[in-house]
Interface confidence: low
């Protein structure tokens, strides 16, 4: 079984987590999104949902970097700073943005009810929404056997984390992983929460 | 300033009901994972349980299993145990805990005292 | 379950000597991601806990670097370099790579 928390679309970008936890590879991350009819958002479009009021606490994949979006500042949440944080060293599992082209270009809360690009397959797959409302369906959508048979059996049990890094500034933009946090192997979110993602500093 | 504060602890009848509360403040409630840790009298620490950001994801230790429920109402900023059929040995102090991360519990709150006893 | 199992259970230490606690687990607590879901925490008499380590060796937000953690799938460390007078308390290690979490017993730190 696997379930995916998503948000409220925001400019078209929305964030996925997956059982709860960082759990989704790079690959698993396009092809979810594909499932979503969407696809890995760009810097650019993340920044124009940041603009709109998108933010999470949660780090995930966008076209070729694995950030988190923040507006306001919170002490517990990227050490206080704003803006697109970069996750510098991303050797790990996260969770995922997604960007939908078709998505009304304000912020957008009604109910996903289904994964319409999803294939036939035994998997039991419940999509939560924010408001809690949840839509179940059988399918697959990962066409990555290391994604479907993980060498790791235990990460679906696996507990979430923080991450620390010093931040530096480049190319405008924050490289920051969390300090006072674990990594996650995942969880419930744009959402802290306990499960397992924790970066150290270096 | 991150605040958790609990409450609703107290003396009560083995098979009783409580209800603990936990009122944050000084952080957005809705976007962190919550928990439950407690601890029995000059016993060690022991995780009762967690919730997700968006209460979609619960989970318990076996030995509250069934009789338990964690919640959360993010537009009151308050996380909520909910114990049935409280058994002398559910005796203990019952804090609640912030999770900025995989299993970090940073900031917890100071505890609310439930006794099960006749 | 994971089993957490800590020595000692109590350690009298004289303050500037240095302090070291150790921690086991009943499985491995290293990921594959490469962090190790160890976290230690110390509870001083009459307070909550406070989270001092987090992944094995990570310190936590103003927490002095005398503390320092160290250790990698079923074997962990807790150093204190050198033990001050504040840092009576009960130490505890809490594996957080699956639930339920588990902690250690707990190690009672007391000046001599």
């Known amino acids: 079984q696997i379930d995916l928390n998503i948000t409220c679309r925001f400019a078209g970008v929305f964030h996925v987590e997956k059982n709860g936890r960082y759990s989704i590879s790079r690959t698993e991350a396009a092809d979810l999104c594909k499932a979503f009819n969407s696809t890995l958002p760009t810097m650019a479009q993340m920044e124009k949902a940041l603009s709109i009021g998108f933010e999470t606490c949660r780090y995930g994949f966008i076209e070729g970097h694995v950030v988190i979006p923040r507006i306001h500042p919170n002490s517990i949440c990227a050490a206080n700073n704003t803006g697109v944080y970069i996750l510098t060293s991303n050797t790990s599992q996260y969770d995922t943005y997604c960007f939908n082209a078709s998505a009304p270009p304000e912020e957008d809360c009604t109910s996903v009810t289904d994964l319409p690009n999803a294939f036939d397959g035994p998997i039991t797959i419940t999509i939560v929404n924010r408001d809690g409302t949840r839509y179940v369906q059988k399918g697959e959508y990962r066409t990555n056997p290391e994604d479907i048979y993980p060498s790791n059996p235990t990460d679906d049990d696996v507990s979430s984390g923080s991450s620390s890094e010093r931040s530096s500034t480049s190319g405008g933009y924050i490289f920051y992983t969390f300090s006072t946090v674990h990594p996650i192997p995942d969880e419930d979110s744009p959402w802290i929460t306990d499960s397992t993602d924790r970066i150290p500093a270096t | 300033e991150v605040q958790l504060l609990e409450s609703g602890g107290g003396l009560v009848q083995p098979g009783g009901s409580l209800r603990l509360s936990c009122a944050a403040s000084g952080f957005t409630f809705s976007l962190y994972r919550m928990r439950w840790v407690r601890q029995a009298p000059g016993k060690g620490l022991e995780w009762v349980s967690s919730?997700?950001?968006?209460?979609?994801?619960?989970e318990y230790a076996d030995s509250v299993k069934g009789r338990f429920t964690i919640s959360r109402d993010n537009s009151k900023n308050t996380l909520y145990l909910q114990m049935n059929s409280l058994r002398a040995e559910d005796t203990a102090v019952y804090y609640c805990?912030?999770?900025?991360?995989?299993?970090?519990?940073?900031?917890w709150g100071q505890g609310t005292l439930v006794t099960v006893s006749s | 379950d994971i089993q957490m199992t800590q020595s000692p259970l109590s350690l009298p230490v004289t303050p500037g000597e240095p302090a070291s606690i150790s921690c086991r687990s009943s499985?491995?607590?290293?990921?594959?991601?490469?962090?190790?879901?160890l976290d230690w925490y110390l509870q001083k008499p009459g307070q909550s806990p406070q989270l001092l380590i987090y992944l094995g060796s990570n310190r936590a937000s103003g927490v002095p670097d005398r503390f320092s953690g160290s250790g990698s799938g079923t074997d962990f460390t807790l150093k204190i370099s050198r033990v001050e007078a504040e840092d009576v308390g009960v130490y505890y290690c809490m594996q957080a790579l699956q639930t339920p979490w588990t902690f250690g017993q707990g190690t009672k730190l007391e000046i001599k």
């Open positions: 499985q491995s607590l290293l990921h594959s991601n490469g962090y190790n879901y």
């Open positions: 919730i997700s950001p968006s209460g979609g994801i619960t």
């Open positions: 805990a912030l999770d900025v991360g995989v299993g970090a519990a940073d900031y």
